[in-house]
Interface confidence: low
């Protein structure tokens, strides 16, 4: 039977899926708080615009009896069960917010393609790319891949005079949901990253990684991995590392590197950290005070999802347009809206754009310093520190293949 949308006559509802299986282990109460804070802001913005309408959220919980792994492994069926719950209740909002696991979003997209926009905090995998009614508010794997290819090819910076064409990727299967899909994209033989590299090998065992660090016969000096500094230390410890090894540590949702009192441990000196530029006001906001850095990004994406809906609702109501139309479902892309801590830009496919930051450890100060930034919206790198105090010879990044001359 047709599911009616509670989405007209001045009353607009958001369906928020509260799934037990989630990209990040965030208490659902915190996500509710984020959504409710978003609703307050949206109501205020609509009121200020002279739009006297009601905006509410319905939280749809799964029973948690069957799908209780807590991570994304059993999320596919949980997502579909929640859709059936909505279907049986004959009640659907104007928009669906919630699925964060790539598995569940991909499957649910097959079942929501007809009518509704879907906003996700997560869904990092390549299989969720180019979905016409899906919006992703946390950086998807495609954005990471484009940065890496751009950076690999760069050879005209004072600190990077070689273009690279090789890499090892460390992926042992214990990664968090975001890292799993980021590395999955790098591993995929058909991906842009694989297509652009001449050599790429995935290291799956700790020992493989450890051996490469001093292996004279290694095929690349560059190793990509995903996680925080502690994750790297557990793997690398205090082992010696060849002087021309470069470890790229992908740790997007962690703004601890930018805190004043942080000192980089010694084992980070051969490491470039890729993270996201921290939000303007987020570190001090009341909303984020009880959240760890990663969870702050996750809950923030829920909050921004509400603000995005409010932004679109305002535009459509001001233009006298119907909300329950394909036009509305397709509209959540190629725009900038006012997010919780500043403007948020979505690309042509509804994926969030951001500023990625590549950090290095200064051998002088033992602090993390910004080497360069990368704007995912224009696929462009901007050098910041033209004379970095690197651990690498001549304060330049080494060639990716030992013994190979200038490119």
């Amino acid at each position: 039977s047709q599911v009616s949308q509670n989405c007209h006559n001045g009353s607009y509802e958001i369906s928020v899926l509260m799934m037990g299986n989630s990209a990040f282990a965030e208490p659902l109460k915190n996500l509710e708080d984020a959504v409710n804070e978003g609703l307050e802001i949206v109501r205020g913005r609509l009121q200020n615009a002279g739009l006297n309408v009601t905006v509410n959220a319905t939280f749809m919980y799964s029973d948690g009896l069957i799908h209780n792994s807590g991570d994304c492994r059993s999320s596919t069926c949980e997502g579909l069960d929640l859709l059936r719950k909505i279907s049986n209740a004959q009640r659907m909002g104007c928009v669906l917010i919630g699925p964060s696991c790539t598995y569940s979003t991909f499957q649910m997209y097959l079942d929501t393609e007809l009518s509704y926009p879907m906003i996700s905090a997560g869904s990092f995998g390549l299989s969720c790319d180019y979905k016409e009614t899906l919006t992703r508010l946390m950086s998807p794997a495609r954005k990471l891949m484009y940065f890496l290819v751009n950076f690999w090819k760069t050879n005209d910076l004072p600190f990077k005079t070689y273009s690279w064409s090789t890499s090892y990727v460390y992926k042992n299967g214990t990664e968090t949901e975001d890292c799993f899909w980021y590395l999955n994209a790098l591993e995929a033989s058909v991906s842009y990253f694989s297509h652009e590299l001449g050599f790429k090998v995935v290291l799956r065992q700790d020992k493989e990684f450890q051996d490469i660090l001093m292996d004279h016969n290694r095929k690349s000096n560059v190793i990509i991995m995903c996680g925080g500094p502690e994750f790297l230390y557990k793997l690398k410890g205090d082992r010696a590392v060849a002087e021309d090894i470069v470890i790229i540590l992908v740790d997007l949702f962690n703004d601890q590197y930018f805190e004043d009192n942080v000192t980089a441990p010694d084992y980070m000196k051969n490491v470039l950290v890729l993270t996201l530029s921290p939000g303007n006001s987020l570190l001090n906001s009341s909303f984020s005070r009880n959240l760890s850095p990663t969870k702050r990004d996750f809950a923030l994406a829920y909050l921004n999802g509400i603000l995005l809906f409010g932004h679109m609702l305002k535009i459509f109501l001001e233009n006298g347009e119907n909300i329950t139309t394909p036009k509305f479902a397709h509209a959540f892309r190629n725009l900038t809206f006012e997010g919780y801590d500043g403007p948020v830009t979505l690309d042509d496919w509804g994926d969030v754009d951001s500023t990625m930051v590549l950090l290095y450890t200064s051998v002088d100060t033992k602090k993390y310093k910004v080497l360069l930034t990368y704007d995912t919206h224009v696929n462009k790198t901007y050098p910041v520190d033209m004379s970095p105090t690197f651990t690498w010879k001549n304060s330049k990044l080494p060639n990716d293949i030992t013994g190979r001359g200038p490119q």
Partner: nanobody, 121 residues
Framework: DVQLQESGGGLVQAGGSLRLTCTTT?????MGWFRQAPGKEREFVAT????????YYADSVKGRFTISRDNSKNTMYLQMNSLKFEDTAVYYC?????????????????WGQGTQVTVSS
């Protein structure tokens, strides 16, 4: 390649019922029913999402027609009740080969040959 085959069409009196069946060689993404009356453009009738959870109908058939699917049998159905003379048309089933949004016929990749439904008054 995906093959679609419609069946169940025929001649029926106004107010009567028919059940159309569409069998496919592969069933995964959204499927739909369209119809084309003589001298008119092909028009959307109903569609059903990949998992069968969501359905959507043209205003002209809402409340009278019911679309459903059985993925275990790779089959989609259109139950047509309270048929009217203006429902007379060739009915086509269609299927997508990728997840894609949109009710227009151009958003469907595979088509059957059609089955004739004639409603007499």
């Amino acid at each position: 390649d995906v093959q679609l085959q419609e069946s169940g069409g025929g001649l029926v009196q106004a107010g009567g019922s028919l059940r159309l069946t569409c069998t496919t060689t592969f069933s995964s993404y959204a499927m739909g029913w369209f119809r084309q009356a003589p001298g008119k453009e092909r028009e959307f009738v109903a569609t059903i999402s990949g998992g069968g959870v969501y359905t959507y109908y043209a205003d002209s058939v809402k409340g009278r027609f019911t679309i459903s699917r059985d993925n275990s049998k790779n089959t989609m159905y259109l139950q047509m009740n309270s048929l009217k003379f203006e429902d007379t048309a060739v009915y086509y089933c269609a299927q997508r080969n990728i997840p894609r949004y949109g009710l227009e016929s151009r958003n469907y990749d595979y088509w059957g040959q059609g089955t004739q439904v004639t409603v007499s008054s």
